[in-house]
């Protein structure tokens, strides 16, 4: 984690900086949203607990052709210790609940901001 997340600047970045950058990207997405995000695509809801970065990536990676979340997908991969590919599902998915990408991003953003405030970066 300490080596990832810094897309704007080269070299290692602290985990807190990586998380701040991810939050800022999610803020950009929510603020710049005009038409429905990713054409209203639906993704699996996730439990916002330990391991949620991989779970979030597993959900979002199944959305293709949506440039608005490509940077988020890349950033999330920096928080997930294993390689994630489309069709992969973790136990953290709420498999009977699908939500719009816009709502997924909003829920994730809220949770990440609280993690940042509480100093939980891993």
């Amino acid at each position: 984690l300490t080596c990832l997340g810094g897309f704007a600047s080269p070299g290692p970045v602290p985990p807190s900086t990586a998380l701040r950058e991810l939050i800022e990207e999610l803020v950009n997405i929510t603020q710049n949203q005009k038409a429905p995000l990713c054409n209203g695509s639906m993704v699996w809801s996730i439990n916002l607990t330990a391991g949620m970065y991989c779970a979030a990536l597993e959900s979002l990676i199944n959305v293709s052709g949506c440039s608005a979340i490509e940077k988020t997908q890349r950033m999330l991969s920096g928080f997930c210790p294993h390689k994630v590919s489309a069709g992969q599902f973790s136990s953290l998915h709420v498999r009977d609940t699908k939500i719009e990408v816009a709502q997924f991003v909003k829920d994730l953003l809220l949770h990440l901001k609280k993690l940042f405030r509480e100093g939980q970066f891993n």
Partner: antibody
């Protein structure tokens, strides 16, 4: 318009219990943290604790842990402070306050306060 | 727990005076996320506190420019550059970096 309104204060005997309420309007309590702060007559401000209503993550000042319990009812957009084994020194105005919603950097809205008097 | 020590506990000043209030924390209040959650609140009798300054030096929306905050590490200052009649009140510093969060004891600014 964002508002916090406390209620439930009043006169209680030493050893008694009281539950204070704080109801939010104009925002969703799950989107932020809510704190309880008190102020004894003529004294300074004291932070009691806070709750994240999204997940019931609660933190207290250790001096209040055990006697005071913070909880939330998201459906009612309300917070509670349950106070047990009350003592004369718990006499104070009790405020709820919310952390601002962007980065939770500070308390941007406070309730008007509710007075609790512990006396026989 | 982190103690926040404010000084002076009270002061008398006249309209137009420059007023400085200091707040010292018993240990560093730099949060693990890099921020320093040091705030200043103003309180008038019978009213809830109002935010003036957050994260050491950021003026809250609507707060007059005569209020400024500075400091780092463990030493922080609130300055009122030219005291106005509506500024007579009690001022509290507050650290929101480490739980339990703590307030300073307050500084009462009175009319000379």
């Amino acid at each position: 318009e964002v508002q916090l309104v406390e209620s439930g204060g009043g006169l209680v005997q030493p050893g008694g219990s009281l539950r204070l309420s704080c109801t939010g309007s104009g925002f969703n309590i799950k989107d932020t943290y809510i704190h309880w702060v008190r102020q004894a007559p003529g004294k300074g401000l004291e932070w009691i604790g806070r709750i994240d209503p999204a997940n019931d993550n609660i933190k207290y000042d250790p001096k209040f842990q055990g006697r005071f319990t913070i909880s939330a009812d998201n459906a009612k957009n309300s917070l509670y402070l349950q106070m047990n084994s009350l003592r004369a020194e718990d006499t104070a105005v009790y405020y709820c306050a919310r952390s601002e919603e962007n980065w939770y950097d500070f308390f941007d809205y406070w309730g008007q306060g509710t007075l609790v008097t512990v006396s026989s | 727990d982190i103690q926040m020590t404010q000084s002076p506990s009270s002061l008398s000043a006249s309209v137009g005076d420059r007023v400085t209030i200091t707040c010292r924390s018993s240990q560093s209040i730099v949060h693990s996320n890099g921020n320093t959650y040091l705030e200043w609140y103003q309180q008038k009798p019978g009213k809830a506190p109002k935010l003036l300054i957050y994260k050491v030096s950021n003026r809250f929306s609507g707060v007059p420019s005569r209020f400024s905050g500075s400091g780092s590490g463990t030493d922080f200052t609130l300055t009122i550059s030219s005291l106005q009649p509506e500024d007579f009140a009690t001022y509290y510093c507050f650290q929101g970096s480490h739980i339990p969060y703590t307030f300073g004891g307050g500084t009462k600014v009175e009319i000379k």
